[in-house]
């Protein structure tokens, strides 16, 4: 397979971004993936010194289908209540806004999107000492921004001062059509402690009006990791596969696009009773990665080690008890079969995928399950050629993989 083309920006190029980035110990990494392989067989990834990751992320509006794989909701259960369109029920499709990754500053070519990521924005990753340059373009119709939960050192790229009249950068709205450049620096305080997993599961969102921005769809995963982290065997390692799972109750009643969705999908917008409890209930989507009723179907390879970065973010106000049927997982050095997630939090677990078959990923809250908060997990043998072609170029590959949200496939 061809090696991914990776451009290491030199110091002169880096000046285009910020004086801080001319440190010779810092690599600024950008990516061209026209010839990238479909999967990369690798376990070990580590780096010798901090990197600066450059991400081009846009907020974009699109119609989101919560249940693309549910062809015809059956007449029983909650399925039809939440998925079927009716004279006073919007159904399964809603206009939403998403974080989308682009290849460069032109914002013309989108990065590849995996179905499994669902509504989530691109996976952002940083180790302690790393810097993430977020080139954010608001391609939506109303003001949004992008801000991390879990990184404390966040500032505008070009200035140490916040824009006039803004107390905190997370409150600063980026207007439609505008580009704003952020510099996120991962500090020691942000990173995992010795008792934490290798990577902390965090998130980023728009914070202009967090409740409504989130209800509208702006959420993405952020991993904050040990510097040059190792696995239990002392190897500098990433797992075979990393899976980001977002348990989220999207309250479409709080979305900025509710009025537009009513106008587009209902016959008599003025006649809709917004306070009708049944109408409101039909707009509350109990989702995993933005999918309901098993529309999210994950695949992992038998015998691989899978890391799961699990978030609970949305309108749910109580804790969630999450399970993988057929599996236990390791969480904080203890094997468990249920993971407790508090609102607006994330946890990291891993497991060895030793049970083949089709399994359920869901939560113990039966009300949430009945309303669609379930996904399927298929564990099966994967026949892929083994090889160590990339063994000596782990550093470049890590940069490539981590920026692209590509799955790391097993040996």
């Amino acid at each position: 397979p061809e090696e991914p083309q990776l451009r290491m920006k030199n110091n002169e190029e880096a000046e285009d971004y910020d004086d801080d980035l001319t440190d010779s110990e810092m690599d600024v990494v950008r990516f061209d993936d026209d010839n990238s392989p479909s999967f990369i067989q690798i376990r070990s990834v580590a780096k010798k010194h901090p990197k600066t990751w450059v991400h081009y992320i846009a907020a974009e509006e699109e119609d989101w289908d919560y249940a693309p794989l549910v062809l015809a909701p059956d007449d029983r259960s909650y399925k039809s209540q939440y998925l079927n369109n009716g004279p006073q029920r919007i159904g399964r499709k809603y206009k939403k806004v998403r974080f989308m990754a682009y290849t460069d500053e032109t914002f013309k070519t989108r990065e590849a999107i995996q179905h499994e990521s669902g509504i989530l924005g691109p996976l952002l990753y940083g180790e302690v000492g790393d810097t993430l340059l977020i080139i954010f373009k608001n391609q939506a119709s109303r003001p949004y921004n992008i801000y991390p939960h879990g990184i404390t050192d966040v500032r505008p790229l070009y200035s140490r001062r916040l824009p006039k009249g803004v107390k905190h950068l997370k409150d600063f709205p980026i207007l439609p059509g505008e580009i704003f450049k952020y510099k996120w620096t991962v500090t020691v305080e942000d990173g995992p402690t010795k008792s934490d997993p290798r990577c902390l599961t965090r998130y980023y969102s728009s914070f202009v009006n967090m409740e409504r921005d989130l209800a509208s769809g702006l959420i993405g995963p952020l991993l904050i990791c040990y510097k040059e982290s190792v696995d239990q065997r002392g190897n500098q390692i990433m797992s075979d596969k990393r899976n980001v799972i977002l348990f989220s109750v999207f309250d479409e009643n709080r979305s900025w696009y509710l009025t537009e969705n009513i106008q587009r999908f209902l016959p008599n917008p003025a006649g809709v009773q917004l306070e009708d409890p049944e109408f409101q209930a039909s707009n509350i989507m109990h989702s995993i990665n933005g999918y309901v009723f098993d529309s999210l179907q994950l695949s992992v390879c038998l015998h691989e080690v899978a890391y799961w970065y699990i978030l609970s973010i949305g309108a749910q106000t109580d804790f969630l008890s999450v399970f993988f049927s057929g599996y236990t997982f390791k969480h904080k050095m203890v094997y468990e079969d249920t993971l407790t997630l508090f609102p607006f939090s994330g946890e990291t677990v891993f497991m060895s995928m030793e049970n083949p078959g089709l399994w359920i990923l869901g939560c113990h809250n039966s009300d949430f399950r009945n309303r669609g908060m379930t996904a399927l997990l298929k564990v099966s043998s994967c026949d892929k050629n083994t090889g160590d072609y990339y063994e000596d170029s782990y550093e470049d590959i890590s940069a490539y993989l981590l920026s692209k949200n590509n799955a790391i496939e097993p040996r």
Epitope: D75, R76, S80, N84, N85, G86, P87, Q88, R89, Q263, R264, F265, L266, P267, N268, P269, A270, G271, V272, Q273, E278
Partner: antibody
């Protein structure tokens, strides 16, 4: 007052095309969707689908996908039903009906379409 | 799709009487059932929606009840102009579906 005036009866041969109009008055046309309902001779009512008068997007019931097309002329507050490649079983009276959020609150008088060779 | 079973299909009554027409849905449709009156040479008329809400301009002798799967239209003290065809229709979800109709005739 709110009313709908539909075009007159049509006599067509199999394979031909018919286009029925439904002119609305007495309300803001784009505030309400328009439903189409079929009633075959001696039969009950069958919902064909609706068109969103705000966006122009049609939704068809499964039995009416393919040969049937809903359209609008918003400036004239008029909705249209076109049936292509007419078949004998299309012989029926076709009604337009305003779509409120709760039901079809006002109906046209119906347009009779007869398909016969 | 939601199937609607309407009964009876035929009903004979005299002016002044009270009659009931029933509709049953194949699954719960909450309160979302409407009733229509069809008369020759007249446009179809919405009588009741959301199970029991009387459409404006409809006489109070018409009433609707029920929720879930079972619904009833009651016409009390029948008037001569009430003899017509009656249809129920669920407006819970698309595709909208109708009952087969009840013909109310003069005894």
């Amino acid at each position: 007052q709110i009313q709908f005036v539909q075009s007159g009866p049509e006599l067509k041969k199999p394979g031909e095309t018919v286009k029925i109009s439904c002119k609305a008055s007495g309300y803001t046309f784009t505030n309400y969707g328009m439903n189409w309902v079929k009633q075959a001779p001696g039969k009950g009512l069958k919902w064909m689908g609706w068109i969103n008068s705000y966006t122009g997007e049609p939704t068809y019931a499964d039995d009416f996908k393919g040969r049937f097309a809903f359209s609008l002329e918003t400036s004239a507050s008029t909705a249209y039903l076109q049936i292509n490649n007419l078949k004998n079983e299309d012989t029926a009276t076709y009604f337009c009906a305003r779509g409120a959020s709760y039901a079809m609150d006002y109906w046209g008088q119906g347009t009779s379409v007869t398909v016969s060779s | 799709d939601v199937q609607i079973t309407q009964s009876p299909s035929y009903l004979a009554a005299s002016p002044g009487e009270t009659i009931t027409i029933n509709c049953r849905a194949s699954k719960s449709i909450s309160k979302y059932l409407a009733w229509y009156q069809e008369k020759p040479v007249k446009t179809n008329k919405l009588l009741i929606y959301s199970g029991s809400t009387l459409q404006s301009g409809i006489p109070s002798r018409f009433s609707g009840s029920g929720s879930g799967t079972d619904f009833t239209l009651t016409i009390s003290s029948l008037e001569p102009e009430d003899f017509a065809m009656y249809y129920c229709q669920q407006h819970y979800e698309y595709p909208l579906t109708f009952g087969a109709g009840t013909k109310l005739e003069l005894k």
